[in-house]
């Protein structure tokens, strides 16, 4: 059976604030638990939602969440079903509403003498307590002609008198919090002695130079004086007139006129009324010089046929707030249609290759105009103007390929070799008409090519074959001097390529044919075994039909190839004796002898007086000191040959000799002594 | 035993009504939730609606309105009244407790 | 309205064989796991095989599995034997206690 180990109760809950229903289930198998709010399934939302078994409200809401909630715990595997008791919230809040007139039924109905009842429409739960307030100033309960009823949250006025008029405003509070009137109520009864509003002045905008009028009226028996004062309190009148304010005249019903309104003009008015008794009042309108400012630019569209587009033009700032239209070849664009303005948004709807062209977004206002130019392009699909063609290009000269294309705007072109983006570099190179160029074609280039063209509404592309027509040349070209060891088997190689397969052979260079023991075969020169009389100067010629022939000249050296009669040995040398490496190297041509001591060739120009090679190769190191130490190497080498071999010199202390040793004993290890 | 059988299928003219009973015996209805779900000849399974413990009804988006489930615990049966029924209701109509405990099936079909 | 769609369709299979059969849902099931799946032979009611996504229904062998979240559900059968030729279907719960079938996969001896 299904059991609730934690059941949801009902609960106390402020509005906005977070809250939670508990619900623990245990049961014999899984269940899944939904929550119902008077019987209908409780669906997860950002603001009330399941966690866990239990229901979090983020912020209860006193709409949505009055009700029954209960927790349902389903087996769906068995059907049974086990439902929590009934929960639900007591939700405390408060709203702030507007102070009305209860009492008469309209303003118009107020008299002095009468009844009039206020009514404060700020409601919460529990019921709060009011307050009310006249010009800020709390009332009373009880105070003389008013009577506050909480019950109702009613103030009543009996009689209304001038005395009362002012500004009624109302709060109220409770256990959740406070709340004051959002909107307060103007009470005002007419004393015939205090001046009142007959007409307000309004604020105006006005061009330079051009005039501006404020009205201002007021009523009272007896009547009322009128005053006009400019921002820095200087009075305005027809008599006495600030410097800067020489063209403004006060009429006799109140209103006053500037003319050739300048910059020194502008700021804030006041029209002061003063009847017999009560405060003066105080009216005020600004007089705002009309101004506007430069438009900003518009990058040039691009746009594609088919296409919705909108194009936003950003009202210069100004005062009065500019107005904005459209224009397109001089006519101004409809509020519909297929090309039409909507707000300040050009808006091109199924864009025809037609709508290309310069649009004007015009901004006017009292001050002036301004407009501002967008360049809009149609793109259109690129055609062929001229396609690449399969091409045979020659093997180290420039190639070509074209693709040709015509597009609004101009297209971009991309190659393609093997599926591969061409990247520009020093051998591919794409002129701005699409032309690929092939600076020093090679044989690999023969392969496919693929051009494309695009531009924002489209792209077509195609395809050629590139075949390298190939140069006659050795692969690779035969060494110019090489040698061959005496009395040796050798093979000198010769392979060329060129657009059919060249045949090869060679030749003596003085013309004479080849000796039997020296046989062609298919390019390589074959020696059995090498004499003196093989050196000299051999020819390769390699030949085609359509290509010719070319030649390659190999000067052949027969040699005997070095080898050490004498090489170095390990050596050991006490520090300050001398040490001496012998090194003595055969061959044909004779071989020259050459040092290297840790890791750097030793100059014999740049020995100094320590060290010295000698005529047969041996090297001789005076006054040996520890960082001599290290491997000596010996090479041997002529025009065909080197070889090297290397042995290390170690510098030690010379030992103190101990008495227990004899003058004779030799050292632990070989030694040159000197 | 805790079994269910469901009766009351048949031929039935296009336009007619027809109430199918599921019989509930060893549980009570009242604990447990009940759903109906019918198969058309040949075709794949297809849930109807379901009662609730307390006697609420859900139903699928195009059962609603035609198809109407209720209960009488005291007779521990559940009913499937179905109203303006079509050629396309035709099928096999079970009765199922959870997903475990489903009844034989019944037949209804719809043709004139 | 919800849709639940099964695949494959129809599946043929030998004995032995590993079987995967997946549903897929239009929108979450209730706390993303509301998903069952059953086993129906010609002329019986639904058998029960799996609940709450991935549990083995009593008497189900453990070749049997399901797994899956939210909308997209796998049933898996290890090695198909003889007796497991049948039709199978996926069923969600969702919010609002509306419970919704796929329209079967139809499994057959290859």
């Known amino acids: 059976a299904i059991v609730f180990i934690k059941q949801p109760s009902s609960q106390d809950a402020l509005q906005g604030r977070r809250a939670l229903l508990r619900c623990e289930v245990e049961a014999p198998g899984p269940v899944h638990v939904y929550w119902l709010l008077d019987g209908a399934p409780v669906q997860d939302t950002e603001r009330r939602f399941a966690q866990g078994s239990s229901l979090s409200f983020a912020a209860v809401d006193r709409l949505q969440d009055s009700g029954t909630f209960q927790c349902v715990a389903r087996d769906d595997v068995t059907g049974e079903e086990a439902r929590s008791a009934n929960a639900s919230f007591n939700i405390k809040w408060i709203e702030a509403g507007p102070v009305v007139l209860k009492h008469p039924a309209s303003e118009a109905e107020i008299q002095p003498q009468t009844q009039v009842t206020l009514r404060c429409h700020i409601d919460g739960h529990p019921r709060p307590t009011y307050q009310w307030f006249r010009d800020g100033t709390p009332l009373s309960d009880g105070q003389s002609n008013h009577t506050v009823s909480s019950k109702e949250r009613n103030l009543t006025l009996r009689p209304a008198g001038p005395e009362h008029s002012g500004l009624y405003s109302c709060c109220a509070h409770s256990a959740f919090g406070q709340a004051c009137s959002s909107q307060n109520f103007t009470l005002s009864i007419a004393d015939e002695s205090f001046a009142r509003v007959v007409l307000a002045p309004q604020d105006v905008v006005v061009a330079r130079y051009e005039e501006a009028m404020f009205h201002c009226q007021f009523s009272a028996q007896p009547p009322p004086s009128l005053q006009w004062l400019f921002e820095d309190e200087t009075p305005i009148t027809n008599r006495s007139r600030p410097p800067h304010l020489r063209r403004a005249t006060v009429f006799a019903n109140g209103s006053l006129l500037l003319t050739q309104v300048r910059p020194r003009n502008a700021g804030i008015y006041r029209c002061i009324g003063q009847g017999q008794r009560g405060p003066p009042i105080i009216l005020e309108a600004t007089l705002h010089l009309a101004e506007i400012e430069d438009m900003p630019l518009f990058e040039p569209r691009v746009f594609t046929a088919g296409s919705e587009e909108r194009v936003t033009c950003l009202p210069p700032k100004g005062l009065p707030e500019p107005s904005v239209w459209w224009e397109h070849a001089g006519v101004r664009l409809p509020t519909h249609g297929r090309v039409y303005q909507k707000g300040h948004e050009l808006v091109l709807a199924n864009i025809a290759e037609s709508d290309a062209g310069v649009y004007t977004c015009h901004a006017a206002n009292l001050a002036g105009q301004r407009r501002q130019d967008v360049n809009i392009t149609v793109a259109t699909v690129p055609s062929w103007l001229k396609k690449p063609q399969d091409s045979q290009l020659e093997e180290g000269k420039p190639g070509y390929l074209d693709c040709l294309t015509q597009a609004t705007p101009k297209p971009t072109v991309v190659w393609y070799r093997n599926q591969m983006l061409i990247s520009e570099d020093s051998r591919f190179e794409v002129f701005k008409n699409g032309t690929l160029r092939i600076n020093s074609v090679e044989v690999y280039d023969g392969t496919w090519y693929r051009c494309m063209s695009s531009t924002p509404a489209g792209s077509i592309e195609a395809q050629a074959r590139v075949q390298v027509l190939e140069k006659l040349k050795f692969t690779p070209p035969p060494q110019p001097q090489q040698c061959m060891e005496f009395d040796k088997e050798a093979t000198v190689p010769c392979s060329a390529t060129g657009r059919e397969k060249p045949t090869i052979k060679w030749e003596r260079a003085d013309g004479s044919s080849l000796p039997e023991w020296v046989t062609d075969n298919a390019g390589t020169l074959h020696f059995a075994r090498v004499t003196r009389d093989d050196a000299g100067n051999y020819t390769c010629i390699a030949s085609n039909g359509p290509q010719g022939q070319i030649r390659a000249h190999v000067q052949l050296t027969v040699a005997v190839f070095i080898t050490f009669k004498v090489e170095p040995e390990r050596t050991t040398v006490y520090q300050g004796h001398t040490a001496l490496l012998q090194c003595e190297a055969q061959g044909d041509p004779k071989p020259l002898i050459q040092w290297k001591g840790k890791d750097r060739i030793l100059d014999p120009t740049k020995l100094g007086p320590r060290m010295h090679i000698f005529q047969n190769g041996s090297l001789v190191i005076h006054d040996v000191a520890p960082e001599d130490s290290g491997r000596y190497t010996c090479i041997a080498g002529n025009s065909c040959n080197i070889k090297h071999t290397e042995a290390p010199l170690y510098v030690v202390d010379k030992p103190v000799p101990e008495e227990s040793e004899g003058p004779g004993s030799p050292p632990p290890y070989k030694m040159i002594q000197t | 035993e805790v079994q269910l059988v469901e009766s009351g299928g048949g031929l039935v003219q296009p336009g007619g009504s027809l109430r199918l009973s599921c019989t509930a015996s060893?549980?009570?209805?009242?604990?447990?939730?009940m759903n109906w779900v019918r198969q058309a000849p040949g075709k794949g399974l297809e849930w109807v609606g379901i009662?609730?413990?307390?006697?609420?009804?859900y139903y699928a988006s195009w059962a609603k309105g035609r198809f109407t489930i209720s209960r009488d615990t005291s007779k521990n049966t559940v009913y499937l009244q179905m109203n303006s029924l079509r050629a396309e209701d035709t099928a096999v109509y079970f009765c199922?407790?959870?997903?475990?405990?489903w009844g034989q099936g019944t037949l209804v079909t719809v043709s004139s | 309205e919800i849709v639940m769609t099964q695949s494959p369709s129809t599946l043929s299979a030998s004995v032995g064989d590993r079987v995967i059969i997946t549903c897929q849902s239009s929108?979450?099931?209730?706390?993303?796991?509301?998903l069952a799946w059953y086993q129906q032979k010609p002329g019986k009611a639904p058998k029960l095989l799996i609940y709450y996504t991935s549990n083995l229904a009593s008497g189900v062998p453990s070749r049997f599995s399901g797994s899956g979240s939210g909308a997209e559900f796998t049933l898996t059968i290890s090695s198909l034997q003889p007796d497991d030729f049948a039709t199978y279907y996926c069923?969600?719960?969702?919010?609002?206690?509306?419970?919704?079938f796929g329209q079967g996969t139809k499994l057959t001896v290859l």
């Open positions: 069923q969600g719960g969702y919010n609002g206690n509306i419970y919704a």
């Open positions: 199922a407790r959870g997903h475990y405990l």
């Open positions: 009662i609730d413990s307390s006697g609420s009804t």
């Open positions: 060893g549980f009570s209805l009242s604990n447990y939730v």
């Open positions: 929108q979450s099931v209730y706390n993303n796991n509301l």
